[in-house]
């Protein structure tokens, strides 16, 4: 297996982006949701994959300079999937006072489809991304972001909503997936694991990353989220993986340094506006895209997911702060807030670049690449 290289010669203050070398493509897991070595079973047996909640989105950002190194998804190491059962998404939360567990949570009852029938849909998120099987679509152009560099005032609301940390974004952050596919950013949020346990929602070749940021957007064709839920393309999420690097990420530090203030679930604080694009990778031209769902109830489908090929680097201390500061409902730590990967059920993940091309020699037999469907339509 090839291991990712650490970021080299990052600019002062540390850039957001990870390295650029491609992920290995060996040892493909045989199932979308088979358990990974990085995700040891939780303290309790978990029901099927639909029961495992997944979070929504985080702040969006616009392209940065190409000076930073970056780790690319197609370069990530792969991990052989052990043969144990479904990968758990259990955050080991325990509700106080013997709660009846009748609200949704990560791991355990109630099964999510009982909370929202859409969670049993066929086209759910997150998914495992296998670059070799992605369809290269030249029509997928670089993402366009406008208005993501926010001034310090007005301040933004940072909230511990009990299942993630959420930054509410002001009006005016515009994003285009392509011509006529225009969106406005609503909020961003994060998903993470626990000490020694990664917590990204999406995986690549079975590899789970330490954390993942989601920036959630609403199509300009709709006035409100509830009008867009379940409508194809009504919502779009930009997702990026967060990895450990040698330097502190100054952009993320503006948020992470305030988590202590919102440790209690339901609490919130105000933070100065910041460059939201600095929270995302710098390369807006290389990404994977597919149609899926919200990763928490109501699990509404029709969501366009764009997963950056480049990762974002945070220091070990920052990743620890993210996973070890917040509390969720019932006096439980807010950790492992990711949903299990869901089956593709025939969906083809598209790539804006030839992700399936492996430049290194390999003895394995060639893989049939999927063809690009209707990218850009």
């Amino acid at each position: 297996q090839r291991l990712p290289r650490m970021q080299e010669d990052s600019p002062l203050g540390g850039g957001s982006s990870g390295e650029d070398d491609p992920l290995g493509e060996e040892d493909l897991p045989s199932e979308e949701d088979s358990p990974r070595e990085e995700d040891p079973p939780g303290e309790e047996d978990l029901p099927g994959e639909e029961d495992l909640p997944g979070e929504e989105d985080l702040p969006e950002v616009k392209p940065k300079s190409e000076e930073e190194g970056s780790l690319k998804l197609e370069d990530l190491p792969t991990v052989e999937a052990p043969g144990d059962p479904q990968e758990p998404q259990n955050n080991a939360h325990r509700d106080k006072e013997g709660d009846d567990q009748s609200h949704w949570r990560y791991g355990g009852d109630p099964p999510w489809p009982r909370v929202s029938p859409a969670c049993a849909g066929r086209f759910q998120s997150p998914v495992d991304i296998r670059p070799q099987l992605a369809a290269f679509c030249p029509a997928l152009r670089p993402l366009e972001l406008l208005g993501f560099q926010l001034p310090p005032l007005p301040e933004l609301r940072l909230r511990n909503n009990g299942h993630s940390v959420q930054l509410t974004l002001p009006p005016g952050l515009e994003m285009a997936l392509g011509p006529g596919r225009e969106y406005r950013a609503l909020q961003l949020h994060l998903h993470w694991g626990a000490a020694g346990r990664p917590g990204s929602e999406h995986t690549v070749e079975g590899h789970r990353f330490p954390a993942e940021i989601h920036v959630v957007h609403l199509s300009t064709a709709f006035a409100r989220v509830d009008e867009a839920l379940g409508r194809p393309g009504g919502l779009a999420v930009l997702a990026a993986f967060l990895e450990e690097g040698p330097e502190e990420n100054s952009a993320y530090e503006q948020l992470l340094s305030r988590l202590e203030e919102i440790a209690e679930e339901g609490s919130e604080t105000q933070v100065p506006g910041l460059d939201i694009s600095a929270l995302l990778p710098s390369d807006f031209s290389r990404y994977f895209q597919y149609e899926g769902s919200l990763t928490t109830p109501p699990c509404a489908q029709g969501v366009i997911w764009t997963v950056f090929n480049q990762t974002v680097m945070l220091s070990a201390k920052q990743l620890h702060t993210l996973s070890d500061t917040l509390w969720g409902p019932g006096d439980s730590r807010l950790q492992l807030n990711f949903r299990a990967t869901q089956p593709l059920n025939g969906r083809v993940i598209e790539a804006s670049f030839p992700a399936g091309v492996d430049s290194s020699p390999r003895a394995a037999e060639p893989v049939q690449l999927n063809s690009c469907l209707a990218a850009g339509d």
Epitope: H103, V115, N161, P171, V225
Partner: antibody
Framework: QVQLQESGPGLVKPSETLSLTCTVS????????WSWIRQPAGKGLEWIGR???????NYNPSLKSRVTMSVDTSKNQFSLKLSSVTAADTAVYYC??????????????WGQGTTVTVSS | EIVLTQSPGTLSLSPGERATLSCWAS???????LAWYQQKPGQAPRLLIY???SRATGIPDRFSGSGSGTDFPLTISRLEPEDFAVYYC?????????FGGGTKVEIK
């Protein structure tokens, strides 16, 4: 069309616990915040607190020590408990839908309200 | 917490007239997350305006909200008989959520 219906005892004795339930019909309870608001006779509106369908709560600091909210997604219901009540807690109690976690837009659906009197 | 002050306490007008209600916040309201509600006797409040200026579903266009920061007026361009009621502003940008004391619009 989403509708809300409050239910619970109309009379509660001082020092006891007021318990109300709001039943959501005509739509899903998931992904929304759900609030409780009260209004003493002839007075204005006071927000008590809210709950998300993950069980996360946020209470008005003035009532926090006495309030507990819970949600039962399988029954499409959420509940309010207010302990150690006094005559000052006599009011009409409303439940309301309070936006989504993806987007805030105020309380767009309200129950018709239930009158709770605290008296021995 | 953010304190919302509404004025006037009572507004006496005739049908067909224009009504302007004011709501002032003690500090800037996050993202202009301010709503207006109408309440008639014996009824629950009804959402009129959210985000300071967006009309809720089914609300006639004679109701319009505006303003930003700390000053948020509500205008009813031409009063209809059914518009006589109490109007509350509410901020939902920061916790705790707070309501103004209300303005009663009565028939002159």
């Amino acid at each position: 069309q989403v509708q809300l219906q409050e239910s619970g005892p109309g009379l509660v004795k001082p020092s006891e616990t007021l318990s109300l339930t709001c039943t959501v019909s005509g739509g899903s309870i998931s992904s929304y915040y759900w609030s409780w608001i009260r209004q003493p006779a002839g007075k204005g509106l006071e927000w008590i607190g809210r709950i998300y369908t993950s069980g996360s709560t946020n209470y008005n600091p003035s009532l926090k020590s006495r309030v507990t909210m819970s949600v039962d997604t399988s029954k499409n219901q959420f509940s309010l408990k207010l302990s150690s009540v006094t005559a000052a807690d006599t009011a009409v109690y409303y439940c309301a839908r309070d936006g989504q976690w993806l987007e805030d837009y105020g309380m767009d659906v309200w129950g018709q309200g239930t009158t709770v009197t605290v008296s021995s | 917490e953010i304190v919302l002050t509404q004025s006037p306490g009572t507004l006496s007008l005739s049908p067909g007239e224009r009504a302007t209600l004011s709501c002032w916040a003690s500090q800037s309201v996050f993202s202009n997350y301010l709503a207006w509600y109408q309440q008639k006797p014996g009824q629950a409040p009804r959402l009129l305006i959210y985000g300071a200026s967006s009309r809720a579903t089914g609300i006639p266009d004679r109701f319009s909200g505006s303003g930003s920061g700390t000053d948020f007026p509500l205008t009813i361009s031409r009063l209809e008989p059914e518009d006589f009621a109490v109007y509350y502003c509410q901020q939902y940008g920061s916790s705790p959520l707070t309501f103004g004391g209300g303005t009663k619009v009565e028939i002159k």
